[in-house]
């Protein structure tokens, strides 16, 4: 009786041992598979995130292109209308120029001394920008950014004068504190006779030969033949 119980116990032990080994193996397999699934999920997640990011970037890029296309189309159709009409008035701005109120503006991306910048504008039937109001100051400031940029204000001939003849004394001014100072301390000969936007939008006088960026302005209603 006792030996029979011993045999049954041994058999149960073997069965249990086999079951444990089998379970351990299954757990290991499942654990491995789980790890693989987790890794695959992570991989898929990062792929999905990347695809979403790429899509988002593509969408933004596409939107920018569409905006630019619409802007160019509007500009071209406007100029076509001018050409088809009698051409006496410019109601739109040339391509790459930005319209604001009654003027068109062109913002350079390179630098030139003040006289060369003004000459460049004149060749475009324009002049260096004349800042006439709070609103125009803010508009230009936004487009120029925190960069030194020439404006159409100079005292090379004595008093400060705007290049288009706008009265300086009664007009808008946005000089930085202590400016203009006609500083001679730079040691480059002479004082400072040309005005420019500084990084914060305030105006400063500087040597006219500095190669700063510049802003051209032309009237929208100006005769297209001139």
């Amino acid at each position: 009786q006792n030996s029979k119980l011993q045999e049954e116990l041994q058999a149960l032990r073997e069965t249990f041992s086999n079951l444990t080994a089998s379970t351990d193996a299954k757990v290991k397999t499942l654990s491995m598979q789980g790890g693989n699934v987790g890794r695959k999920m992570k991989s898929l997640e990062s792929q999905l995130e990347k695809q979403q990011q790429d899509l988002s970037e593509d969408h933004s890029s596409l939107l920018l292109h569409v905006k630019q296309f619409v802007s160019d189309l509007r500009s071209l159709s406007c100029q076509m209308a001018v050409l088809q009409g009698n051409g006496s008035e410019r109601t739109c701005c040339p391509v790459n120029w930005v319209g604001y109120e009654g003027s068109c503006y062109w913002f350079s991306r390179s630098g030139k001394p003040w006289p060369e910048a003004e000459k460049y504008c004149q060749l475009e039937n324009a002049h260096l920008v004349v800042v006439g109001s709070w609103e125009e100051q803010k508009f230009i400031q936004h487009h120029v950014g925190p960069v030194n940029s020439w404006i159409g204000l100079t005292d090379q001939s004595g008093p400060w004068k705007w290049v288009d003849g706008t009265d300086y004394e009664s007009g808008f001014k946005n000089w930085r504190p202590e400016q203009p100072d006609d500083w001679y301390g730079h040691g480059l000969g002479g004082g400072e006779d040309c005005a420019h936007f500084t990084e914060d939008g305030g105006w400063n006088d500087d040597i006219c030969q500095r190669p700063y960026r510049w802003v051209c302005e032309t009237q929208r209603d100006r005769d297209s033949g001139s």
Epitope: W134, E135, Q137, K138, F139, H142, F172, K173, N174, W175, P177, E178, D200, G201
Partner: antibody
Framework: QVQLVESGGGVVQPGRSLRLSCAAS????????MHWVRQAPGKGLEWVAI????????YYADSVKGRFTISRDNSNNTLYLQMSSLRAEDTAVYYC???????????WGQGTTVTVSS | DIQMTQSPSSLSASVGDRVTIACRAS??????LNWYQQKPGKAPKFLIY???SLQSGVPSRFSGSGSGTDFTLTISSLQPEDFAIYYC?????????FGGGTKVEIK
Amino acid sequence: QVQLVESGGGVVQPGRSLRLSCAASGFTFSSFGMHWVRQAPGKGLEWVAIIWHDGSNKYYADSVKGRFTISRDNSNNTLYLQMSSLRAEDTAVYYCARDLSMGGMDVWGQGTTVTVSS
Amino acid sequence: DIQMTQSPSSLSASVGDRVTIACRASQNIISYLNWYQQKPGKAPKFLIYTASSLQSGVPSRFSGSGSGTDFTLTISSLQPEDFAIYYCQQTYSTPLTFGGGTKVEIK
């Protein structure tokens, strides 16, 4: 520390005049534009006027144009608001504030109360 | 004149809540928008300039966004000291104009 202190408020009859002052300390007054802003009892903020650091530009709210004058004395670090032809609707707490880049107001005084009443 | 419209005019929220205040300009003001906070009996406090730049010393839970005509002030996790009135202000054009204010109250 940077400080603005308004004074000159009080009770005044309609049609009369009053001059508010704002004493600045703790910063280079002559390097900053300055504003006046007002707040009627229980109401929101209303911008009144701005003057450039050097006095070269002055702008006013339509509601005070021709009646109020903003001025400054950089040697005494003081901002002024001359108010004339006062009306009941000018009743408010008047604040002076330092300008940050054409329009922002980064430092404010504690305010002075103006009451226009007969 | 440029009109500034804030919404809502008032809201109730709890400490820890995320709060969003909208400000709309009647015309394009690019990004020339500031936000102020005012507590009862006190002068306004400058929070945010040019739509999204945080004024020095202002907690980072405050943030601003938007351009053109639509702007937002967000408080990511409302603190007890944030219960106040918030004003937007445009500086693109004179006369400078403020929104009517948004009162943030305790729920």
